[in-house]
Interface confidence: low
């Protein structure tokens, strides 16, 4: 006859792992018993258990209440155990030796792995502003047994780097990801991909990116000169920008104090009736966490009237 | 152990306001952005804001722009989400989460707006 078991046993950290043992034997033979060791190399051999053809299963007192007979029905010639929550330690080789009767003993090993899948951890860089250059965007971790792989997944270009500390019976891989921040990059996702043969698909992470910038400031309004003239309403200049976190706004006058009657609206400065004294230079600030701009522009209100003078002047000298 | 408990929800008439609240522990809160994010019945999870870890930077999704406020408060390890003008379609379980990771997630608490 001959002894059937696997060279490898898988299983994944806290779950059941099943020893085969099965004795294909001849017509007519037997099996006594069945005696499980762990015999890891420069150890000697530690019992497991006992399993015999008439009283059961006889388990030593380090495996108690964690060695067992599989459910029946059961082969009479199958010599199997199932070692209840596998952990870390149990990692290592295991010798079936069948006792049968009349052919004698036979003995086969197998290796128990145990898989420790990894908890990874997402941790973000320092803050992220436009204009830096190559930096930290997040490094996630992630600890198994075997190594876990830690890749990225995202439309945001950037470089990554690993690294891997070997422990007694696990390891530690670390990826990061650089980038050169831009605000383009604002929101987009970024995400830590951790496969291992413990995990029955791939863990994902996600950390949304956050860019703090500032845009140039302009001042719209000033398009068409013309219609800044003597008593014309409605009359406005609007600071345009944009920024993360969102700006806020402020309007000055360079040559002197706003005057009275304009009024301030966050991003809008709104003028009265067109005098001559609303011609200046008006100052739109643009400021958050990140940074501040400034833009500045001359009103200049023009007077009809000397308007009309200069092209009688001209018509006449025509 | 990272725990996050939100509380604040319930019923509101539309037009109406709440304010959410999560408290932390289990980490150094004051370090990480955190955020909320909403899941309606039968559909998928989704961003509503994010906040800082000092405070300064907020983020909002465009639906509750101007409506809601997200603030926190690093010394009593809470974070807020002030929701003003509710309206029906802002009915959902609201989550409180460590934003930058995101597998740390509250049980979440219910907000219905309805008359």
């Known amino acids: 006859g001959e002894l059937e078991t696997s060279d490898v046993v898988t299983v994944v950290l806290g779950q059941d792992a099943k020893l085969p043992c099965f004795y294909r034997g001849d017509s007519g033979e037997q099996v006594g018993q069945v005696a499980w060791a762990r015999v890891d190399a420069g150890e000697g051999a530690q019992e497991l258990a006992l399993l015999h053809s008439k009283y059961g299963l006889h388990v030593s007192p380090a495996y108690e209440g964690r060695v067992e007979q599989p459910p029946p029905p059961r082969n009479p010639l199958d010599g199997s155990v199932l070692l209840r929550n596998a952990v870390q330690a149990d990692e290592g080789e295991y010798e079936c030796r069948v006792s049968t009767f009349p052919a004698g003993s036979f003995q086969a090993r197998l290796r128990l792995r145990v898989l420790v899948p990894p908890l990874p951890s997402l941790n973000p860089g320092p803050a992220l502003e436009e204009g830096q250059g190559l930096t930290l965007a997040a490094s996630c971790t992630a600890e198994g047994s075997p190594a876990p792989s830690v890749t990225w997944d995202t439309e945001v270009k950037g470089t990554t780097s690993s690294r891997s500390f070997k422990h007694s019976r696990s390891a530690a891989v670390t990826s990061e990801f650089h980038l050169v921040p831009s605000r383009s990059m604002n929101g987009q996702p970024l995400t830590c991909v951790v496969s291992h043969p413990g995990l029955l698909q791939d863990q994902r992470i996600t950390h949304i990116l956050h860019v703090s910038f500032l845009a140039e400031a302009s001042v719209r309004g000033l398009e068409d000169q013309n219609l800044w003239h003597i008593g014309r309403e409605g009359a406005m200049l609007k600071c345009l920008s944009e920024g993360q976190p969102p700006p806020s706004y402020n309007w000055t006058r360079l040559d002197g104090p706003l005057p009275s009657g304009v009024r301030v609206d966050g991003d809008t400065l709104g003028f009265p009736p067109l005098t001559t004294e609303h011609s200046g230079i008006y100052v739109c600030h643009v400021s958050n966490e990140f940074s501040s701009r400034d833009s500045q522009v001359t009103v200049d209100v023009l007077d009809p009237q000397e308007d009309s003078g200069k092209q009688v002047d001209l018509v006449s000298a025509s | 152990e990272v725990q996050l408990l939100e509380s604040g929800g319930g019923l509101v008439q539309p037009g109406g306001s709440l304010r959410l609240s999560c408290a932390a522990s289990?980490?150094?809160?004051?370090?990480?952005?955190m955020g909320w994010y909403r899941q309606a019945p039968g559909k998928e999870r989704e961003f509503v804001s994010a906040?800082?870890?000092?405070?300064?930077?907020?983020y909002y999704a465009d639906s509750v722009k101007g409506r809601f406020t997200i603030s926190r408060d690093n010394s009593k390890n809470t974070l807020y989400l002030q929701m003003n003008s509710l309206k029906p379609e802002d009915t959902a379980v609201y989550y409180c989460?460590?934003?930058?990771?995101?597998?740390?997630w509250g049980q979440g608490t219910q907000v219905t707006v309805s008359s």
């Open positions: 989460a460590v934003e930058l990771t995101y597998n740390y």
């Open positions: 289990g980490f150094a809160y004051s370090s990480y952005y």
């Open positions: 906040i800082s870890s000092s405070g300064g930077g907020t």
